[in-house]
């Protein structure tokens, strides 16, 4: 008799899961030297550990505290670049700007990336055909989980000027429920951090409005403020040219606006 | 908050050994990873060595071998030891203790001076 299975209304697991978190893995520390200390079979087995045999809809931030120390590694504070909604964008800078980071150029974000998992309450199966979808089944499920405690800790280490990209063609520019308004915003510690600098991307190529006086930004503005930490906001009217400057600051047309 | 001092430092002759000590203010259990980072005159700040809690190590290609990171948690103390010291060992070594994934805490440094 089959058994019966829980049907959720999200996708599955990644397939070949396991084997794509263990590659990763490898291929980090290979390519960053500081982590060599890592042993990838035990990031796997604790990375298993926090979702395997669990209720999918039951994940707590505990589940994943063996994992978060094995995944530790020295992020420059000053250095910390988030984004909300215009993830290669940042990821493009990042490459680019090689002493600047995104989450997912930690180990943890790295292995994370794009990835989905679940397991099933009593069993050792990953399942690969579906997995709690975030609104339409529940928020403690294994990957919103993962993503609010990594999330909350790279913001809790960022000091000095942190830089947020937002996406200028989105109706929300900053957006309350995203992982950044909702978890990395709150986790920024005034006693270090002296000021968020929010870029926000525009879209369209005519587009010259000024999007640091959309209503969404203020808001941001007012709830940087009231935690004691300053605000400011620069339109990047021009990404293509931003991306093309960063890696060649020395080009005559990159004193201009971008 | 975590507060680092580094000892031990100073001057040595080519082919001498070191060691340098780093104690932390509060208690290394809690400290995910212990590490050396130096900084030569003119140069960034490169990795050296670490050590998780897990006693698992991992060492720049320049001083493997020669260098050995240890740490005693009962005296919240990180040590490097170094041999075979070459002048282009030369700059000022920091401690860093990573607590809570991401948040790391440096030391003031203390310098190492190779004479050849």
């Known amino acids: 008799v089959p058994r019966w299975r829980q049907q959720w209304s999200g996708p599955g697991t990644t397939k070949r899961f396991p084997e794509t978190v263990l590659a990763r893995c490898v291929k980090y520390t290979e390519i960053h030297p500081e982590m060599r200390h890592v042993d990838c079979q035990s990031v796997w087995d604790a990375f298993k550990g926090a979702f395997i045999s669990k209720h999918p809809c039951n994940i707590t931030e505990e589940d994943y505290q063996p994992l978060m120390k094995l995944g530790t590694q020295t992020v420059p504070c000053n250095k910390i670049l988030l984004w909300s909604r215009i993830k290669d964008l940042a990821h493009q800078f990042t490459q680019v700007q090689r002493d600047m980071f995104t989450l997912e150029d930690t180990l943890l974000g790295y292995l994370a990336d794009d990835l989905t998992w679940c397991g099933e309450f009593n069993t050792s199966k990953i399942n690969y055909q579906s997995c709690p979808d975030w609104r339409k089944d529940c928020s403690n499920n294994p990957v919103s989980v993962f993503w609010k405690t990594v999330s909350r800790r790279f913001a809790e280490a960022a000091c000095d000027v942190v830089h947020v990209m937002l996406n200028g063609s989105r109706s929300k520019i900053f957006d309350k429920n995203s992982t950044f308004g909702s978890v990395e915003v709150h986790n920024l510690q005034p006693e270090k951090v002296q000021t968020l600098e929010a870029w926000v991307i525009h879209g369209g190529r005519e587009d010259s409005r000024d999007l640091c006086q959309d209503p969404t930004i203020k808001e941001l503005e007012s709830i940087i403020s009231k935690r004691n930490i300053q605000f400011s906001c620069k339109n990047i009217y021009r990404p293509d040219k931003f991306l093309q400057c960063v890696k060649n600051p020395e080009d005559s047309s990159c004193t201009s606006e971008i | 908050q975590v507060q680092l001092q580094e000892s031990g430092g100073g001057l040595v002759q080519a082919g001498g050994s070191l060691t340098l000590s780093c104690a932390a203010s509060r208690n290394t259990d809690s400290i995910e990873i212990m590490g050396w980072y130096r900084q030569a005159p003119g140069k960034q700040r490169e990795w050296v060595a670490t050590?998780?809690?897990?006693?698992?190590?991992g060492y720049a290609d320049s001083v493997k071998g020669r260098f050995a990171i240890s740490r005693d948690n009962a005296k919240n103390t990180v040590y490097l030891q170094m041999h075979s010291l070459k002048p282009e060992d030369t700059a000022v070594y920091y401690c860093t203790a990573v607590i809570r994934t991401y948040s790391t805490y440096w030391g003031q440094g203390t310098q190492v001076t190779v004479s050849s």
């Open positions: 050590i998780n809690t897990g006693g698992n190590t």
